[in-house]
């Protein structure tokens, strides 16, 4: 069971300082942006991180949403990352959910975050280059100190 608590507005960056945004095709991508670019591209660069109470505490449970015309929420259904047109629900009556991630602070690096799927233990949000695009994907952690699964989260509230 997950019960919604509070939400905050955040900018999410990879460790190369690229900013996460949602493009016109609703794809989550990373791109180099100045602070003014980041502001100019809002609300596509501003993510709503909603925290949830977890009946089986496994870390800080969150959903990641974005509000353009409508609210879309990040999902990792079948280990594929996509934004689904939905509000983060008030309650989720299950111990796993494709939209719930555990936001983990990397020990020794308070400002570096990982997002582990609640549906797929050991799978994390990651940034991966595919041709000329830097995509947000779900990835099994396969090497120690993998920088691609680490992010910084800057609160905009």
């Amino acid at each position: 069971y997950f019960g919604k608590l509070e939400s905050k507005l955040s900018v999410i960056r990879n460790l190369n300082d690229q900013v996460l945004f949602i493009d016109q095709g609703n794809r989550p991508l990373f791109e180099d942006m100045t602070d003014s670019d980041c502001r100019d591209n809002a609300p596509r660069t501003i993510f709503i991180i909603s925290m949830y109470k977890d009946s089986q505490p496994r870390g800080m449970a969150v959903t990641i949403s974005v509000k353009c015309e409508k609210i879309s929420t990040l999902s990792c259904e079948n280990k594929i990352i996509s934004f689904k047109e939905m509000n983060p629900p008030d309650n989720i009556k299950d111990t796993k959910s494709d939209i719930i991630f555990f936001q983990r602070s990397v020990p020794g690096h308070d400002n570096k975050m990982q997002f582990e799927s609640s549906s797929y233990e050991g799978y994390f949000l990651a940034c991966e280059k595919e041709r000329d695009l830097f995509k947000l994907i779900l990835k099994k952690e396969d090497e120690l100190g993998d920088r691609s699964i680490m992010f910084t989260v800057q609160n905009e509230d």
Epitope: L5, M51, K53, Q56, P57, R58, M60, P107, D110
Partner: antibody
Framework: QVQLVQSGAEVKKPGSSVKVSCKAS????????ISWVRQAPGQGLEWMGN????????YYAQKFQGRVTITADESTSTAYMELSSLRSEDTAVYYC????????????WGQGTLVTVSS | QSVLTQPPSASGTPGQRVTISCSGS????????VNWYQQLPGTAPKLLIY???HRPSGVPDRFSGSKSGTSASLAISGLQSEDEADYYC???????????FGGGTKLTVL
Amino acid sequence: QVQLVQSGAEVKKPGSSVKVSCKASGGTFSSYAISWVRQAPGQGLEWMGNIIPITGQTYYAQKFQGRVTITADESTSTAYMELSSLRSEDTAVYYCARAAYHPLVFDNWGQGTLVTVSS
Amino acid sequence: QSVLTQPPSASGTPGQRVTISCSGSSSNIGNHYVNWYQQLPGTAPKLLIYRNNHRPSGVPDRFSGSKSGTSASLAISGLQSEDEADYYCQSWDYSGFSTVFGGGTKLTVL
């Protein structure tokens, strides 16, 4: 980097209660679990329970259920552990520990508080 | 009696490699993750290894962790005098809420 500073040593009589505090500074307090772990003289580590301040949820080890109460004050970034019905075998160093990765991965520790139970 | 079994003591000479074992069962290590803590004399424990084999920032790469079946081990290579300490293993449950520690191993650098 977060720092956890605990209250000073206590000497208590059997049957009484003790309340130990743990103040966090320099990091996020509310979102991450604060655990209490004790260590009797010359012995190993024993997890007592924890609290997640933002939710107020508490979890206690079965052994301490009913005798320990863990609370947190978000406004002062302070966690508290109260242990009642003290007996001599509760003489130990009591540590608070923050868990920012997972509620049971203790990545930052307080300096410890010695509680002596003696008549 | 601890749920996780560690040898009470271990020793080595400077530069040597030492391994500390931690034995459990399917209800703890067999199905869950393992952490290791180092406790220098008179100080609070410090996280050394988390999630079986991950090192927090600042922990030298001389320390490594591994897990196989219902046992885990901590290896320290290039032993140094400052490694003299007590070492504790801990197993934690991803989905439930319980944790157990080993009884600790006192490492002496000869």
